[in-house]
């Protein structure tokens, strides 16, 4: 019996035209909601006249649907055993499932103003960019609607810029009718252990945004992983979003809808700092906003986004160290809302149910020749939002999922 | 080392077109403002403007506007400055210099002297 | 435009004694003024920059203060090699604007 299941399960998971693994890899069958906190800032005045705490207070949820769009351009290759997609982006707003409107309004960093000295460091360009801030009446902070915040609007001090520049800025932008990928994953063919493991990401091997093995693509897309997962397996995988491959180690079983799940998490030491875990030291890529790579918990992806000073980190700076927090007020770490785990069946490999939760944030630093930031007398790392991206396998397909897989093992 | 070279003196005639150029080395060309200078003899200094030659965003004192035009040359790391309708009172020692990010004019060409006579 | 005036206008001072120029600008510049010496026939040479920053390989006789408005270039004991041209640069804005110079000589 154990071998005729097993034998099922390899062919079924397989990621080819007419498997289970296949039907559901294409278009996922989960309905995936992404939820967002803004960090409204209460004090901007005060922030930007005398460099004091920021006080931010979350407003949310505020729900998209997300995911719902199937794999394009999907081609087979036997000679290497591999399927190469790309994944459409689309986000459509759920107003049942939200606080309030897309046009709901936020005090928020100034992305441009904050972003600019950071990308042009030479003073002159700096003195021209703040006459063209001062011109445009911009401030360190600007208030904003969600729709403008999240997917773009048309910012009026990058408007007076000279010369050609992307006028439009967004924590998402563009994000619908844009695509993620191309992936090129191993569809398991000839060998079931490297199912779903990306071979390339946009035509390489390396993201060239880190040194050494930080650069490295390794494991899926976190949607499944190869059959058979035992306990003391590290997940790996790779998520574009914030740029790097990560992993998840094992917390606990889980009885999801009946059935057994394992539910791996992402551990603390995967966003520590080298000092304590050595393996992350090609993840510290500067040394002064680091403390000579000591803080931890707040990962720089600037190179991964044309140089503009974006830094990722778990919701309300979980598992960040002290000097990260400090700047802020109205932070409330809390584990079980804000990290992030996998519940992964593991005859079969499929994430059924997931939590994606991340922070995105803004460093914004002193700039002499910048009267909107030269009251600064420290840098920040700024919150700007957080999200959780969620799935859990519908009662539907659970039922049928119980009765051709774990029922059978039973 | 960094170093700026310009180009020889010029005698000009009233009317007339000059373009002067400033040769970099020893540095990352594209990152660093190149300005333009003027002494007249015996004079105090007159900022003509700057280009950065990344984007090639220029920005000119309102008063040589018209006068000046600068232009970078990325692939030979060369910037230049042509001055059109001379006058007596353009003749004059024309620098190049370069900033060093936050440290304006760290670095100096040696001057070109540009001599309006009929 | 920010226009800065400098004085005095020539100085002529004995070796060893303390050399003082002042720069007063038009606008509140902050701390953005710069100080050049220039010798006949050589380029100006940064002496020392934006907020009093002294750079590196000038001697420390050379010191600046002030903000706002107000700029004093130093010079602690006058050495013969000290003799040439100075000038205020105002860095806080465009256009950017020079100081009409001091002659310094020995006496």
């Known amino acids: 019996g154990d071998m005729l299941i097993e034998k099922t399960i390899k062919r079924e998971v397989v990621l080819e035209e007419g498997t289970t693994a296949f039907k559901n890899w294409v278009k996922t069958g989960t309905t995936v909601y992404r939820q967002f906190w803004i960090f409204d800032v209460q004090n901007p005045d005060d922030v930007a006249k005398n460099s004091s705490k920021i006080k931010v207070k979350q407003r949310g949820p505020y729900t998209y649907r997300v995911r719902y769009l199937a794999k394009e351009n999907i081609t087979q290759d036997p000679e290497d055993h591999t399927v190469s997609f790309v994944q459409p982006n689309g986000a459509i707003f759920e107003p049942s499932l939200s606080v309030g409107t897309e046009d709901d309004n936020f005090t928020v960093l100034n992305l441009a103003v904050a972003a600019a000295p950071h990308i042009y460091q030479n003073s002159f360009v700096q003195v021209v960019l703040n006459s063209l801030i001062k011109k445009s009446k911009s401030s360190m902070f600007q208030t904003r609607s969600l729709k403008e915040l999240l997917w773009g609007y048309k910012d009026p001090f990058l408007s007076l810029v000279p010369y050609p520049i992307s006028t439009t800025v967004g924590v998402f932008y563009p994000y619908n009718d844009t695509v993620d990928g191309v992936y090129k994953v191993f569809n398991g063919k000839d060998n079931i252990s490297k199912v779903a493991i990306i071979e390339s990401y946009k035509g390489k091997r390396n993201l060239s945004y880190w040194p050494s093995y930080c650069d490295m693509i390794n494991g899926t897309d976190a949607a499944s992983f190869p059959p058979f997962v035992e306990k003391s397996r590290t997940l790996r995988f790779f998520s574009s979003d914030i740029c790097r491959s990560i992993y998840a180690v094992f917390g606990s079983e889980i009885d999801l809808k009946g059935i057994p799940v394992y539910r791996f998490v992402l551990p603390a030491n995967a966003f520590a700092s080298p000092l304590q875990n050595p393996d992350n030291h090609c993840f510290c890529t500067e040394k002064v906003i680091s403390n000579n790579c000591t803080s931890y918990g707040v990962l720089d992806i600037g190179k991964c986004k044309e140089g503009k000073p974006v830094y990722i980190s778990l919701p309300h700076f979980l598992h960040a160290s002290p000097d990260v927090s400090e700047p802020i007020e109205g932070l409330h770490p809390n584990e079980d809302e804000h990290r992030t785990y996998l519940d992964v069946e593991p005859i079969t490999g499929f994430t059924l149910q997931f939590a994606k939760r991340l922070q995105v944030n803004i460093l914004v630093k002193p700039a002499r020749k910048i009267e909107a930031l030269k009251n600064l007398k420290r840098p920040y790392i700024v919150p700007i939002l957080w999200l959780n991206e969620t799935g859990t396998i519908g009662d539907e397909k659970a039922e049928m999922f119980k009765t051709q897989v774990t029922g059978k093992i039973k | 080392e960094v170093q700026l070279q310009q180009s020889g003196p010029e005698l000009v005639k009233p009317g007339a077109s000059v373009k002067i150029s400033c040769e970099t080395s020893g540095h990352t060309f594209t990152e660093y403002t190149m300005h333009w200078v003027k002494q007249s003899h015996g004079k105090s200094l007159e900022w003509i403007g700057g280009i950065y030659p990344n984007n090639g965003a220029t920005k000119y004192n309102q008063k040589f506007k018209g006068k000046a035009t600068l232009t970078v040359d990325k692939s030979s790391s060369t910037a230049y400055m042509e001055l059109r309708s001379l006058t007596s009172e353009d003749s004059a020692v024309y620098y190049c210099?370069?900033?060093?990010?936050?440290?304006?004019?760290?670095?100096w060409g040696q001057g070109t002297l540009v001599t309006v006579s009929a | 435009e920010t226009t800065v005036t400098q004085s005095p206008a020539s100085l002529s001072m004995a070796i060893g004694e303390k050399v003082t120029i002042r720069c007063i600008t038009s606008?509140?510049?902050?701390?953005?003024m710069n100080w050049y010496q220039q010798k006949p026939g050589e380029p100006p040479k940064l002496l020392i920059s934006e907020g009093n920053t002294l750079r590196p390989g000038v001697p420390s006789r050379f010191s600046s203060s002030g903000y706002g408005t107000d700029f004093i270039f130093t010079i602690e004991n006058m050495l013969s090699e000290d003799v040439a041209d100075y000038y205020c640069l105002q860095s806080d804005n465009l256009p950017l604007t020079f100081g009409a110079g001091t002659k310094l000589e020995l006496k």
């Open positions: 606008t509140d510049i902050d701390d953005d």
């Open positions: 210099a370069r900033d060093r990010y936050d440290v304006w004019f760290a670095y």
